[in-house]
Interface confidence: low
Amino acid sequence: RPSFSLVEDTTLEPEEPPTKYQISQPEVYVAAPGESLEVRCLLKDAAVISWTKDGVHLGPNNRTVLIGEYLQIKGATPRDSGLYACTASRTVDSETWYFMVNVTDAISSGDDEDDTDGAEDFVSENSNNKRAPYWTNTEKMEKRLHAVPAANTVKFRCPAGGNPMPTMRWLKNGKEFKQEHRIGGYKVRNQHWSLIMESVVPSDKGNYTCVVENEYGSINHTYHLDVVERSPHRPILQAGLPANASTVVGGDVEFVCKVYSDAQPHIQWIKHVEKNGSKYGPDGLPYLKVLKAAGVNTTDKEIEVLYIRNVTFEDAGEYTCLAGNSIGISFHSAWLTVLPAPGREKEITASPDYLE
């Protein structure tokens, strides 16, 4: 299994082609520092899947593992936060999926709702080899206490094997856990030995026990869920920033983006670009390029300002400041107008025009 690390240099190669990226909807994955995180790339069994973080290819490291369509980050740190992309290279074209990863203390214990590492959990048994239930992946069960902010999604897993294949049921505080016991019910992925509860509320607090049994025996494991009440919000961007700007060819310009966020935000500057003469792909999504993103050596103050030196006509267009945290994503946009040089440099700041 090859391993990849998270490289923190955040500058895109100039020759890298623009990609389509739907700003409003990248999946957001969250983890607490020290936890493991698994991201699923729905491009699936492509011949070659390459991964990038903030536009930079991921390099080898023993904390990050690529297994098929999954990127696993072990012992996550805040520096692992960022915009991840998986790209499937095909003979004719390529396709890319984007994910926001946020490593912060205030998060859900679970990963995404459709955990699909069932291949390692499903143990095929010889029909003659009878066996009582047993745990197949105790690593996924080590964290017994889960403190989760209200409204987050929680997943508890009890990967098991046995012959015949055991069944799984769940108890809450020692009693049968029924769908009607909570608003919205819950979801069980038997194939992956998981219980999923979305939008948890304080009444979901308690002990959750998986009971795995077949005719030769029974095993169980208990998790404790604590629901932490808070009023989360996605990043707030200061109104009017970034502001539209105009400058002459050869001049310098800067865009400023002020971000306010309780949860650790990840900030990026994105340029709307053209591909084959079009600003939008066939599915109506804009072509975008990540110009600047927070990295190891970048302070919050530095990332909040985008400098463009020695401006050319190609620099004209729409620029977007995008900020995401574990709660969601916000973005404001501004336009840069580039004027012919009249003989001396001139910089004008126009009225704000931003999206939200």
Partner: antibody, heavy 120, light 106 residues
Framework: MVQLQQSGPGLVKPSQTLSLTCAIS??????????WNWIRQSPGRGLEWLGR?????????DYAVSVKSRITINPDTSKNQFSLQLNSVTPEDTAVYYC??????????WGQGTLVTVSS | ELTQPPSVSVAPGQTARISCSGD??????ASWYQQKPGQAPVLVIY???DRPSGIPERFSGSNSGNTATLTISGTQAEDEADYYC???????????FGGGTKLTVL
């Protein structure tokens, strides 16, 4: 157990607006991991996804290109339901309309379906 | 665009296979739905090959290359229905369905 209950008129006149509602029980329209979809089925077109609404710290909508200019899907958190509005209908819009919940990328719960006929 | 055969026939107890083809479909996840007359579709396979709880083990799925396949082993009379495959477009914005296959149990 999640259940989706559809309601709305079965007959709409051409050029008017088709309006349907889908009431949710056993789940929340403001769920942070589900999406709420409208799908229609007609003999000529088969199953056709029309659009969805979903909440991820704010509300989002996606619509199929074929109806994008005419469709609106709105959530109603107070009643835990969501609605479909399709403007300027023609006989081509005659179909059985379904609401469905999706846990990307599949539709795991469906409403009972409503036959909507567009005719004068 | 997902393409399915309009009809498939199978004798009781035999294996029925319904195909669904689309450009590079194997690069995406396929789902399958069963629909009986006058009823809403029911999810029988998701993520290519996973079965929701309550769906009999005789239903299985696979997906590679340009073709996803729904396999019903030991087909029973109650399996007679229309079957639809479904997948998604780039970045999941649009969902697409196959045209449907009528399964007849002889």
């Amino acid at each position: 157990m999640v259940q989706l209950q559809q309601s709305g008129p079965g007959l709409v006149k051409p050029s008017q607006t088709l309006s349907l509602t889908c009431a949710i029980s056993g789940d929340s329209v403001s769920s942070n991991s589900a999406a709420w979809n409208w799908i229609r089925q007609s003999p000529g077109r088969g199953l056709e996804w029309l659009g969805r609404t979903y909440y991820r710290s704010k509300w989002y909508n996606d619509y199929a290109v074929s109806v994008k200019s005419r469709i609106t899907i709105n959530p109603d958190t107070s009643k835990n339901q969501f609605s479909l509005q399709l403007n300027s209908v023609t006989p081509e819009d005659t179909a059985v309309y379904y609401c469905a919940r999706s846990y990307y990328p599949d539709f795991d719960y469906w409403g009972q379906g409503t036959l909507v006929t567009v005719s004068s | 665009e997902l393409t399915q055969p309009p009809s498939v026939s199978v004798a009781p107890g035999q294996t029925a296979r319904i195909s669904c083809s689309g450009d590079a479909l194997g690069d995406k996840y396929a789902s399958w739905y069963q629909q009986k007359p006058g009823q809403a579709p029911v999810l029988v396979i998701y993520d290519d090959s996973d079965r929701p709880s309550g769906i009999p083990e005789r239903f299985s799925g696979s997906n590679s290359g340009n073709t996803a396949t729904l396999t019903i082993s030991g087909t029973q009379a109650e399996d007679e229905a229309d079957y639809y495959c479904q997948s998604y477009a780039s970045q999941g914005i649009h969902y697409v369905f196959g045209g449907g296959t009528k399964l007849t149990v002889l």
